[in-house]
């Protein structure tokens, strides 16, 4: 087989039809789409293309210039009257720049064989395109049969003599793709077998998915895959000041289009999305979480003087609980409850009040009751102690009333009703409460516990005792019940305003049982436990006073 090496054919004067063709063609040459990267565009090469034709009298370059006097590289061949044509045109080495699939766009004109007299037997209306991969930029000196055929190229529209007369040129555009490529570059070759062709432009390109920012993720320029149906998964990187839960990905199609986005980036706390970037929250604004769309004004009673704030600072005397969301207003403890009233029933007190005028901006207001027992003489108060019961409870009261039971009778109490809310414990300020002073009613006194024997004689017993621990009012009198032991049904009662008595008319050397109880305006208390004392025999002297255990 013939070698394709050597033999650059020098330009010659072009026939009229080529000139007409170029004028028309130039008007149709438009810029490439953004997803196409040119590896070669014969229209933009200013100097020598460096292509070679074999044989020398086959393809020839037509030296034309455009309106800016830039050269137009056009190759033509028109050996339609001669048999066995095998004219080759070889490009220079083309780098594939990492692309594994490339596209070849040819713009050409083709003469209609029917419009050529006498050439019907030898005239062809197609030409062939081949390629050869090579890592070597000087690898054109190869055999014909080492070239791989891409396709036979036919014209969609051929032109006739009539078209020439009307100055209408029919420019064909054909695109073919080649892949997968495995070497650094390649050569193209165009074989003419007897057609009348003008090759106006050759553009070799690959497709890419152009770099793009989607959902705050940057996806880089991505060369499409070798397979025409292949989708390449591409990872995006979040723009400055953005974060992601699910790494952003998109798929680059063979046509250079981004498809099927997965995941997204979000502006981090303190930043918001504006025009595809994450911009800082300005002072007075904050964003607590990446999942929030935009910066918001600080809530009431809070501020921030920082850029990129993720929360706002509470104003003086305002607070935020840890459990309060950063979007919630800062709040303060409530003011004191108002209009407290009391209702005393013996040793129970019912308190009622209305809520504070200022809840501090919170809904979680509750009440706490502090109980103090006060000495009316000394004016000193002390905690009430554990014996007092609160109904329903002492603290965390949601209702505006409470009942205290098991209080001491005839005792001065001060009840402090304090309003509290979720930030009361954060505030160093004074407690906010309303005080109510009450005195419990008198009640029956508690039992007498401490009885001492006095002078004991054969017919009498003298006793003394102390006031009950809890008189529960003013003691009006004592009632002393006594009887001879084992004669309980036959008892005697003495009343005394003092804490001493003498029982007369007793039998000598007999055991008597004594019980004492006190009375207030509220009634009698219960009798004391039984105390036993024995009168002296007839002949004995009276005994000394001593305390009965």
């Amino acid at each position: 087989p013939a070698s394709l090496a050597g033999c650059y054919s020098a330009p010659r004067r072009a026939p009229l039809w080529t000139c007409l063709l170029l004028c028309a063609a130039l008007r149709t040459l438009l810029a490439s789409p953004s997803n196409e990267v040119n590896l070669l565009d014969s229209r933009t090469v200013m100097g020598d293309l460096g292509w070679i034709a074999f044989p020398k009298n086959g393809w020839e370059e037509i030296g034309e210039v455009d309106e800016n006097y830039a050269p137009i590289h056009t190759y033509q061949v028109c050996k339609v009257m001669e048999q066995n044509q095998n004219n080759w045109l070889l490009t220079s080495w083309i780098s594939n720049e990492g692309a594994s699939r490339i596209f070849i766009e040819l713009k050409f004109t083709l003469r209609d064989c029917n419009s050529l007299p006498g050439g019907l037997g030898t005239c062809k209306e197609t030409f062939n395109m081949y390629y050869f991969e090579s890592d070597d930029q000087n690898g054109r000196n190869i055999k014909e049969n080492q070239y791989i055929k891409i396709d036979t190229i036919a014209a969609d529209e051929s032109f006739t003599e009539l078209d020439l007369g009307d100055r209408v040129m029919k420019l064909n555009t054909e695109v073919r793709d080649v892949g997968p490529l495995s070497k650094k570059g390649f050569y193209l070759a165009f074989q003419d077998v007897g057609a009348c062709i003008a090759l106006v432009s050759v553009r070799v390109y690959y497709k890419k998915c152009p770099s793009v920012v989607r959902h705050l993720a940057v996806f880089p320029d991505t060369i499409t895959g070798a397979d025409s149906s292949q989708l390449l998964e591409v990872s995006g990187s979040c723009v400055n000041h953005s974060v992601t839960d699910e790494p952003p990905k998109m798929h680059c199609s063979a046509e250079g289009e981004w498809l099927v986005p997965i995941g997204k980036c979000m502006c981090k706390a303190g930043y918001e999305e504006k025009n595809g970037t994450c911009q800082v929250c300005r002072p007075g604004f904050f964003k607590a979480s990446p999942h929030i769309q935009s910066c918001g004004k600080c809530p009431p009673h809070s501020y921030t003087h920082e850029e990129a704030s993720t929360s706002c600072v509470c104003e003086k005397d305002y607070f935020r609980r840890e459990s309060d969301p950063p979007t919630m207003a800062c709040t303060r403890p409530p003011s004191a409850p108002r209009n407290a009233i009391s209702n005393v029933n013996e040793t129970s007190v019912f308190l009622e009040w209305i809520p504070p005028a200022d809840t501090g901006g919170r809904k979680d207001v509750s009440y706490y009751i502090a109980c103090k027992k006060c000495n009316s003489h000394a004016g000193v108060c002390e905690e009430c102690g554990g014996h007092v019961r609160y109904l329903p409870r002492q603290s965390g009261l949601k209702n505006t009333s409470v009942m205290m039971v098991d209080l001491l009778a005839h005792t001065n109490y001060t009840f402090e009703i304090e309003a509290v809310n979720g930030v009361s414990d954060l505030s160093p300020g004074a407690r906010q409460y309303v005080s109510v002073n009450v005195t419990t009613n008198q009640a029956a006194p508690s039992p007498v516990t401490n009885v001492k024997k006095g002078k004991i004689a054969k017919n009498s017993i003298s006793l003394s005792w102390q006031e009950p621990d809890r008189p529960n009012g003013i003691i009006l009198e004592y009632e002393i019940k006594y009887f001879e032991k084992d004669q309980e049904t036959s008892y005697t009662i003495i009343k005394s305003k003092e804490t001493t008595i003498t029982a007369e008319g007793l039998k000598p050397a007999s055991v008597y049982v004594f019980q004492i109880r006190a009375r207030t305006a509220a009634g009698y208390g219960v009798f004391s436990r039984r105390f036993e004392f024995e009168t002296t025999p007839v002949f004995a002297a009276s005994s000394d006073q001593s305390q009965i255990p």
Epitope: P283, G284, K297, Y303, H305, E306, E307, K316
Partner: antibody, heavy 120, light 111 residues
């Protein structure tokens, strides 16, 4: 009671340096942005610089950018203005002023000012 | 930078009368529905005092005869009934973007 007290002013030659201080009390200094504002004799107010509570946000007027540095020490409740390459036109009373808490914030408390005179 | 221009440079108003001072910004000082415009009063030898923030909000402790209005680029400070202690210089200031520029000031005298 909120108080801001400037100090460090005085007479300095052109090209010289001076460091102003602003001592703060009566509020939680570390959460407040503070401004420096100056007033040339017989002239109006001119904003100079700003620093946020955590020193994360700092702004300067174009006239002082590259020459003045605003800083603060929250442990000492003190704001500073380091002034280098001083010029005659920097002669002014320098005030520190607290950024307010009511949005949108104004400068709600001001110091009494300290006079800086730049003259040969 | 945003340039703030006050008018008039000075004015004299009788006691009990209304005083109006205007301030025009070279570009809008509004952001997200708020006007970042403040007004200050300064008496000779004293530090300035904040009167109005956010174009129309009265600072606490300031008498209600002072009021502010406006949005975008045009703002007004009004003193409804002039008192002797209102004689002072008044400054507008924008805090929408740095640098936080002041107007040149308006000197108010009592007639």
């Amino acid at each position: 009671e909120v108080q801001l007290v400037e100090s460090g002013g005085g007479l300095v030659q052109p090209g010289g340096s001076l460091k102003l201080s602003c001592a703060a009390s009566g509020f939680t200094f570390s959460t407040f942005g503070i401004h420096w504002v100056r007033q040339a004799p017989g002239k109006g107010l001119e904003w100079v610089a700003y620093i946020s509570g955590a020193s994360t946000t700092i702004y300067y007027a174009d006239t002082v950018k590259g020459r003045f540095t605003i800083s603060r020490d929250n442990s000492k409740n003190t704001l500073y203005l380091q002034m280098n390459s001083l010029r005659a036109e920097d002669t002014a009373v320098y005030y520190c002023a607290r950024y307010g808490t009511s949005f949108p914030y104004g400068l709600d408390y001001w110091g009494q000012g300290t006079l800086v005179t730049v003259s040969s | 930078d945003i340039v703030m221009t006050q008018s008039p440079d000075s004015l004299a108003v009788s006691l009990g009368e209304r005083a109006t001072i205007n301030c025009k910004a070279s570009q809008s000082v509004d952001y997200d529905g708020d006007s970042y415009m403040n007004w200050y009063q300064q008496k000779p030898g004293k530090a300035p005092k904040l009167l109005i923030y956010g174009a129309s909000n009265l600072e606490s402790g300031i008498p209600d005869r002072f009021s502010g209005s406006g949005s975008g680029t045009d703002f007004t400070l009004t003193i409804s009934r002039l008192e002797p202690e209102d004689a002072a210089s008044y400054y507008c200031q924008q805090s929408n973007e740095d640098p936080f520029t002041f107007g040149q000031g308006t000197k108010l005298e009592i007639k």
